[in-house]
Interface confidence: low
C-alpha cells in the first residue's frame, strides 16, 4: 500500500481556488525526491501538470504552484481560477509518475448558483443554526408572514405566522416578529440538514402589495481535516463544536459503509470494544470543546472520523460535526514492541516502552488506563523519582536500555494488576504506546522469603532462589527507592534446594546486611537481567527492630513470613492482623475492604512464544 496520502475528494465552485495537501513519510530520500501533481487520462497514463522541479503545464500557467514542506513531510498544490474543465481524477505523488508512490484525488468543480437579483446568501455549517431576515413595509405589518422553499418549479410553504410548520422542519424552526419599531421578521432554523439547502422566499402579505425577499441557503458539509499518523503511534482529535452545544452529549464515530457512523466513544459511556485500553475522551472545557486520544494505532483504524453533539450520543441528522480523514502510515518510525505482557500472581513483569530517541532527556511516564468516566489514565510512576503511593516498593521506571527504550518493572502482581498501561513522555505525544498486562496461572520463578524483620546492629542474610532456567542471566540484589533500584553486593551460595527437577544450575544468591541500621529498612528486590535488559524480580520488605538477643539472622524461606496475627507495617500498607491491604485498584471494584494478599512472594512472568507481539517478564 502506498504511504502517500491526501484528500480523496475536493469540491469547489467555478472561479474559486483550492489547496490540496499531500503527505509522505519524511525519510531523507522522500524529502528530496521529485513531487508531482498529474491528471489521469482515460487510457491510464498520468500527465504532469506541475512538479517540484519547476515544470508547470500551460493549462496551469499563472494559476498554480507546488510547495514542498520537507520538515513536515507534506507538499501543497494550490490551483486558482477553477473552471468546470478542471473536474477530473488526479494523483499527487513522489518520484516518477508511473511508480505507484501516489494518492488518487478526485476534483469536482461545479457551476456557481444562478441567483436572482437581490438574493441574500446564507452559508452555514451542517448542524448549525441560520437566521433568515425578512424586511417588510408598514402596510404589511399586520398581515401574514411566511417562508417558502423552492422545490423544483413550485414554492412549498415552510412556516407562517398563523402557526403552520412544514413536517420536515418540526421541532427545529420558529418565526420571530420583531417589536413594533422594526419592520422585520426572522425565521430561525436549527440543526441544519444538507437537505435544507436551496432557494427560499420570505413574504409579508398575500396580495400584489406583498413584500418579498429571496434567500439562498448553502449548507456546508465539513471538509475532513487530513491526519497522517504512524502505525503503533497515537492520534488526538480536537473537537470544538461551539458553546451552544456545551451541555449536549458528545461523540466520536467512524464512518463505515454508506452513511453509517459507528460510535467509537461518547460522553454517555459507550466505547467500541476495538478501542478498549487505548482511548481517552478528555474532559470538556466550559465551551464544550473536547479531545479524543487513540493510541496503539492499527491499520484498520484508518478511515473517516466524525465528532459531534447529539442527546443520543451518536450521529443524527442535524448534529453539528467536525470531520477527519485518518491515514495510518505502515512505514512507521515507531518500533514494534510487545502489546501483551504476561505474569503470574505474586510474580513480576518487565515492560519495554519505546520513545522518540531524539528526546532522550524527556520525562518518561507510565499510567494505568481506566475505562470509567470515558477513560482516564492516572500516572503511576515517572522518571523524575515520583511513584504513586500505593505502588511504593513494587514499581520502578528505569531509563535502561536507553536509545529509544525505557523499562518499567512491576512486581508482587495480583489479579487486579491485569489491564492496559500506557507508556508516554512529555515530548513527542505521538509516541504513546499501550501494553496489556495479563495475569496467568502459574508459580513465581524466583523464590524469596515473605516480609523479614532485621535487628539493629546485627547481620541479616536474605536468600533468593533462582531456578536453572536463569543460569546464563546476571543475578542481582538491589534496594528499591523512588528513583530506581540501587544495586547491592550479594553472594552466590551455590545450588538451590528450593526447586524440584532442577539441576546444579539453580542458584541461591544471598543479600547480606551487616550491622543493620534504621536506614536499612525498606524494600529489596532480587532479579535477573541480561546486559541492560531486565527480566523477573521478586521483592521482600525488611523491617528493622530493637535488639532482643545477640547474634545474626539468617532468614529461610519457611520462617520469614509474618505470622497471621503479627503487626506488619510496610509501604504496601499491610494492615493490622492481615485484615486489609491497601490495593492500588481498590476503587475499580468499589470494595469496602481490600482482599488480603501476600505482599512479596517472588516473581515470574511467562513468555508466550506464540506471538511476536507478546512479551514475558524475562523474554530477553
Amino acid at each position: 500500500k502506498s504511504p502517500i496520502f491526501g484528500p480523496e475528494e475536493v469540491n469547489s465552485v467555478e472561479g474559486n481556488s483550492v489547496s490540496i495537501t499531500c503527505y509522505y513519510p519524511p525519510t531523507s530520500v522522500n524529502r528530496h525526491t521529485r513531487k508531482y501533481w498529474c491528471r489521469q487520462g482515460a487510457r491510464g497514463g498520468c500527465i504532469t501538470l506541475i512538479s517540484s522541479e519547476g515544470y508547470v503545464s500551460s493549462k496551469y500557467a499563472g494559476r498554480a504552484n507546488l510547495t514542498n514542506f520537507p520538515e513536515n513531510g507534506t507538499f501543497v498544490v494550490n490551483i486558482a481560477q477553477l473552471s468546470q474543465d478542471d473536474s477530473g481524477r488526479y494523483k499527487c505523488g513522489l518520484g516518477i509518475n508511473s511508480r505507484g508512490l501516489s494518492f488518487d484525488v478526485s476534483l469536482e468543480v461545479s457551476q456557481g448558483p444562478g441567483l436572482l437579483n437581490d438574493t441574500k446568501v446564507y452559508t452555514v455549517d451542517l448542524g448549525r443554526t441560520v437566521t433568515i431576515n425578512c424586511p417588510f413595509k408598514t402596510e404589511n405589518a399586520q398581515k401574514r408572514k411566511s417562508l417558502y422553499k423552492q422545490i423544483g418549479l413550485y414554492p412549498v410553504l415552510v412556516i407562517d405566522s398563523s402557526g403552520y410548520v412544514n413536517p420536515n422542519y418540526t421541532g427545529r424552526i420558529r418565526l420571530d416578529i420583531q417589536g413594533t419599531g422594526q419592520l422585520l421578521f426572522s425565521v430561525v432554523i436549527n440543526q441544519l440538514r444538507l437537505s435544507d439547502a436551496g432557494q427560499y422566499l420570505c413574504q409579508a402579505g398575500d396580495d400584489s402589495n406583498s413584500n418579498k425577499k429571496n434567500a439562498d441557503l448553502q449548507v456546508l458539509k465539513p471538509e475532513p481535516e487530513l491526519v497522517y499518523e504512524d502505525l503503533r503511534g497515537s492520534v488526538t482529535f480536537h473537537c470544538a463544536l461551539g458553546p451552544e452545544v456545551a451541555n449536549v452529549a458528545k461523540f466520536l464515530c467512524r464512518q463505515s459503509s454508506g452513511e453509517n457512523c459507528d460510535v467509537v466513544v461518547n460522553t454517555l459511556g459507550k466505547r467500541a470494544p476495538a478501542f478498549e485500553g487505548r482511548i481517552l475522551l478528555n474532559p470538556q472545557d466550559k465551551d464544550g470543546s473536547f479531545s479524543v486520544v487513540i493510541t496503539g494505532l492499527r491499520k484498520e483504524d484508518a478511515g473517516r472520523y466524525l465528532c459531534g453533539a447529539h442527546s443520543d450520543g451518536q450521529l443524527q441528522e442535524g448534529s453539528p460535526i467536525q470531520a477527519w480523514q485518518l491515514f495510518v502510515n505502515e512505514e512507521s518510525t515507531i518500533p514494534r514492541s510487545p502489546t501483551v505482557v504476561k505474569g503470574v500472581a505474586g510474580g513480576s513483569v518487565a515492560v519495554l516502552c519505546p520513545y522518540n530517541r531524539k528526546e532522550s532527556k524527556s520525562i518518561k511516564y507510565w499510567c494505568l488506563w481506566e475505562g470509567a468516566q470515558n477513560g482516564r489514565c492516572p500516572l503511576l510512576v515517572d522518571s523524575e523519582g515520583w511513584v504513586k503511593a500505593q505502588y511504593e516498593g513494587r514499581l520502578s521506571l528505569l531509563e535502561e536500555p536507553g536509545n529509544g527504550t525505557f523499562t518499567v518493572i512491576l512486581n508482587q502482581l495480583t489479579s487486579r494488576d491485569a489491564g492496559f498501561y500506557w507508556c508516554l513522555t512529555n515530548g513527542d505525544t505521538l509516541w504513546r504506546t499501550t501494553v496489556e498486562i495479563k495475569i496467568i496461572e502459574g508459580e513465581p520463578n524466583l523464590k524469596v522469603p515473605g516480609n523479614v524483620t532485621a535487628v539493629l546492629g546485627e547481620t541479616l542474610k536474605v536468600p533468593c532462589h533462582f531456578p536453572c532456567k536463569f543460569s546464563s542471566y546476571e543475578k542481582y540484589w538491589c534496594k528499591w527507592n523512588n528513583t530506581g533500584c540501587q544495586a547491592l553486593p550479594s553472594q552466590d551460595e551455590g545450588p538451590s534446594k528450593a526447586f524440584v527437577n532442577c539441576d546444579e544450575n539453580s542458584r541461591l544468591v544471598s543479600l547480606t546486611l551487616n550491622l543493620v541500621t534504621r536506614a536499612d529498612e525498606g524494600w529489596y528486590w532480587c532479579g535477573v537481567k541480561q546486559g541492560h535488559f531486565y527480566g523477573e524480580t521478586a521483592a521482600v520488605y525488611v523491617a528493622v527492630e530493637e535488639r532482643k538477643a545477640a547474634g545474626s539472622r539468617d532468614v529461610s524461606l519457611a520462617k520469614a513470613d509474618a505470622a497471621p496475627d503479627e503487626k506488619v507495617l510496610d509501604s504496601g500498607f499491610r494492615e493490622i492482623e492481615n485484615k486489609a491491604i491497601q490495593d492500588p485498584r481498590l476503587f475499580a471494584e468499589e470494595k469496602a475492604v481490600a482482599d488480603t494478599r501476600d505482599q512479596a512472594d517472588g516473581s515470574r512472568a511467562s513468555v508466550d512464544s506464540g506471538s511476536s507481539e507478546e512479551q514475558g517478564g524475562s523474554s530477553r
Epitope: L280, N282, P283, V293, Y365, C367, Q373, R376, C377, P378, L379, W386, K388, A389, L424, T425, N426, G427, T429, R432, L586, F587, E590, K591, A592
Partner: nanobody, 124 residues
C-alpha cells in the same frame, strides 16, 4: 501550581473529636480518589481512609466506626471527622489526592499530590 492545604489539626484529650479539612488550590480540571494518611514518629506513613469520586470509602481497621471521610467534589475538598480519639491516633496527618491539573500539556493524566501535613496530638 496545584497544592493541597490541610487544616483542623491540634491538641485534644482522649475521647475528644477533631475535623480535618484538605482543600486543593490551583488550576484543576478534575479530582479522582482522595484520602488521609498518617505517620507517627518512628513509623511508616499508613493509610487512614480513602474516598473515591463516587464516594466509596475504605478505612484502616483501627479507625473503623470512629473516623468518617467525606468530600465535596465541587470544592475539591476532603474531610476527616475523627471521634473517640485515642493516644495512639497521635501522628502527622497527610492529605492525598489524585488530580488532573489543567496545565498538563502532554495529556489527560491524573497524578497524586500530598499536603504538608497537620499535627494531631491526643493526650491521655
Amino acid at each position: 501550581e496545584v497544592q493541597l492545604v490541610e487544616s483542623g489539626g491540634g491538641l485534644v484529650q482522649a475521647g475528644g473529636s477533631l475535623r480535618l479539612s484538605c482543600a486543593a488550590s490551583g488550576s484543576i480540571l478534575s479530582t479522582n480518589d482522595m484520602g488521609w494518611y498518617r505517620q507517627a514518629p518512628g513509623n511508616q506513613r499508613e493509610l487512614v481512609a480513602r474516598i473515591s469520586r463516587g464516594s466509596s470509602t475504605i478505612y484502616t481497621e483501627s479507625v473503623k466506626g470512629r473516623f468518617t471521610i467525606s468530600r465535596d467534589n465541587a470544592k475539591n475538598t476532603v474531610y476527616l471527622q475523627m471521634n473517640s480519639l485515642k493516644p495512639e491516633d497521635t501522628a502527622v496527618y497527610y492529605c492525598n489526592a489524585d488530580m488532573l491539573p489543567s496545565d498538563l500539556s502532554h495529556g489527560y493524566y491524573y497524578r497524586d499530590y500530598w499536603g504538608q501535613g497537620t499535627q494531631v496530638t491526643v493526650s491521655s
